[in-house]
């Protein structure tokens, strides 16, 4: 004969566990039901009924099958310098992830904690390697025969044009110059971009070091053009 | 206030090892880059290592490459300096530093208070 | 690597005196140059970053100037408080170093 099914709450077998979405209550020492995602248990078990679950309340959630008395509260809002991701539901928390031009400079379980700017690099530097959503821009002194004029997070050290005859000679920032007659060959007129990053860790040193810098917060800095631009945190 | 805070210093015999810790406060530790600056008894500054805000990049003065090895934990707000194969010439006040935000901001614009390595048998 | 040629390496000047101390690099750096200040015993200080910017907090009798090779620091009317030796460092290639430095001496 079939074993009989056992309905919420029963007595489990000894040695045996409670079922799947179920689990042990140790006071009424029974299997009772879990409650579902976005429910959390509004009244335990006892030896003769079983879990009363309840929905959970605005900007509280529950995401896996539970039996706490309360429902987890939804993260803050986003700050300004990050964008939601994910809205908080009855089922899932919110996720602020950094916004455009900005990296997550500490990260927490979901979303971020800490967003802050992409490096810019100045004139003479070059993107060596492209920021991402975890990390930051590294720059590096453009090489001889390249250069770069912008203040920029994407822009790379460009070649300098040649010139039949060079009317002023290109420096890491600035192109050479020709005289009026056009250059033999010049590079595409405007910024060049990088693509998307390459994730590999670099340990460089010379002769053109890959360094990186950090976002700035202006209330810490010691001095005006201060490095980094620290975000606002996402809890 | 910023603050850098070295400790981890003292008295190594020739070829050991030692490493040294920077806590760090007063500013958002994961964005800013940071290096170990070193200075001799009555000597001058010698930059040593370098490491950007997330512990990607890093840079060493061929004086102590392949010895020394720089790090950080963004958790924990410190950054350490781990020194094998230590020689006489070694010996120096090591100092924390904030900075440089490289290719940005290139300076160095706070500095701890220093921890001394002596290197002797 | 970049040589850095700092001078005078000591100097001996009076209150109220007009000091310039020169920083040569062995090729351009393209202004990326802070001066520190450092006393006996302490830890040094950022003066002057960018070549010619000031530091906050840094009183306007510092100033530097220069660009491509030539770096120059001036105290414009020396204090009592600036008795000290002054660095120069370049961030262009790395290593980053530093000039040998200037003691600036009381007369």
């Known amino acids: 004969l079939p074993a009989q099914v056992a309905f919420t709450p029963y007595a489990p077998e000894p040695g045996s566990t409670c079922r799947l979405r179920e689990y042990y209550d140790q006071t009424a020492q029974m299997c009772c039901s879990k409650c579902s995602p976005g429910q959390h248990a509004k009244v335990f078990c006892t030896k003769t009924s079983d879990t009363v679950c309840d929905s959970c309340e605005d900007s509280t959630y529950t995401q896996l099958w539970n039996w706490v008395p309360e429902c987890l509260s939804c993260g803050s809002r986003c700050s300004s310098d990050q964008v939601e991701t994910q809205a908080c539901t009855r089922e899932q928390n919110r996720i602020c992830t950094c916004r455009p031009g900005w990296y997550c400079a500490l990260s927490k379980q979901e979303g971020c904690r800490l967003c802050a700017p992409l490096r810019k690099c100045r004139p003479g530097f070059g993107v060596a390697r492209p920021g991402t959503e975890t990390s930051d821009v590294v720059c590096k002194p453009c090489a001889p025969g390249t250069f770069s004029n912008t203040t920029s997070s994407t822009d790379i050290c460009r070649p300098h044009q040649i010139c039949n005859v060079v009317a002023i000679p290109g420096n890491a920032s600035m192109d050479a110059v020709c005289t009026s007659t056009s250059p033999t060959r010049s590079m595409a007129p405007g910024a060049v971009h990088l693509p998307q990053p390459v994730s590999t860790r670099s340990q460089h040193t010379q002769p053109t070091p890959e360094p990186s810098t950090a976002p700035s917060t202006s209330f810490l800095l010691p001095m005006g053009p201060s490095p980094p631009a620290e975000g606002s945190t996402g809890d | 206030e910023v603050q850098l805070v070295e400790s981890g210093g003292g008295l190594v015999q020739p070829g050991g090892s030692l490493r040294l810790s920077c806590a760090a406060s007063?500013?958002?530790?994961?964005?800013?880059?940071l290096s170990w600056v070193r200075q001799a008894p009555g000597k001058g500054l010698e930059w040593v290592a370098y490491i950007n805000n997330g512990g990607i990049s890093t840079y060493y003065s061929d004086t102590v490459k392949g010895r020394f090895t720089i790090s950080r934990d963004n958790a924990k707000n410190t950054l350490y300096l781990q020194m094998n194969s230590l020689r006489a010439e070694d010996t120096a006040v090591y100092y924390c530093v904030r900075g440089p935000f490289y290719g940005s901001a290139n300076y160095f614009d706070y500095w701890g208070q220093g921890t001394l390595v002596t290197v002797s048998s | 690597d970049i040589q850095m040629t700092q001078s005078p390496s000591s100097l001996s000047a009076s209150v109220g005196d007009r000091v310039t101390i020169t920083c040569r690099t062995s090729e351009s750096i393209y202004s990326n140059l802070p001066w520190y200040q450092q006393k006996p015993g302490k830890s040094p200080k950022l003066l002057v970053y960018?070549?010619?910017k000031l530091a906050e907090g840094v009183p306007s009798r510092f100033s530097g100037s220069g660009s491509g090779t030539d770096y120059t620091l001036t105290i414009s009317s020396l204090q009592p408080e600036d008795f000290a030796t002054y660095y120069c460092q370049h961030f262009w290639v790395t290593p980053w170093t530093f000039g040998q430095g200037t003691k600036v001496e009381i007369k």
């Open positions: 007063g500013f958002a530790f994961s964005t800013y880059d």
């Open positions: 960018d070549a010619t």
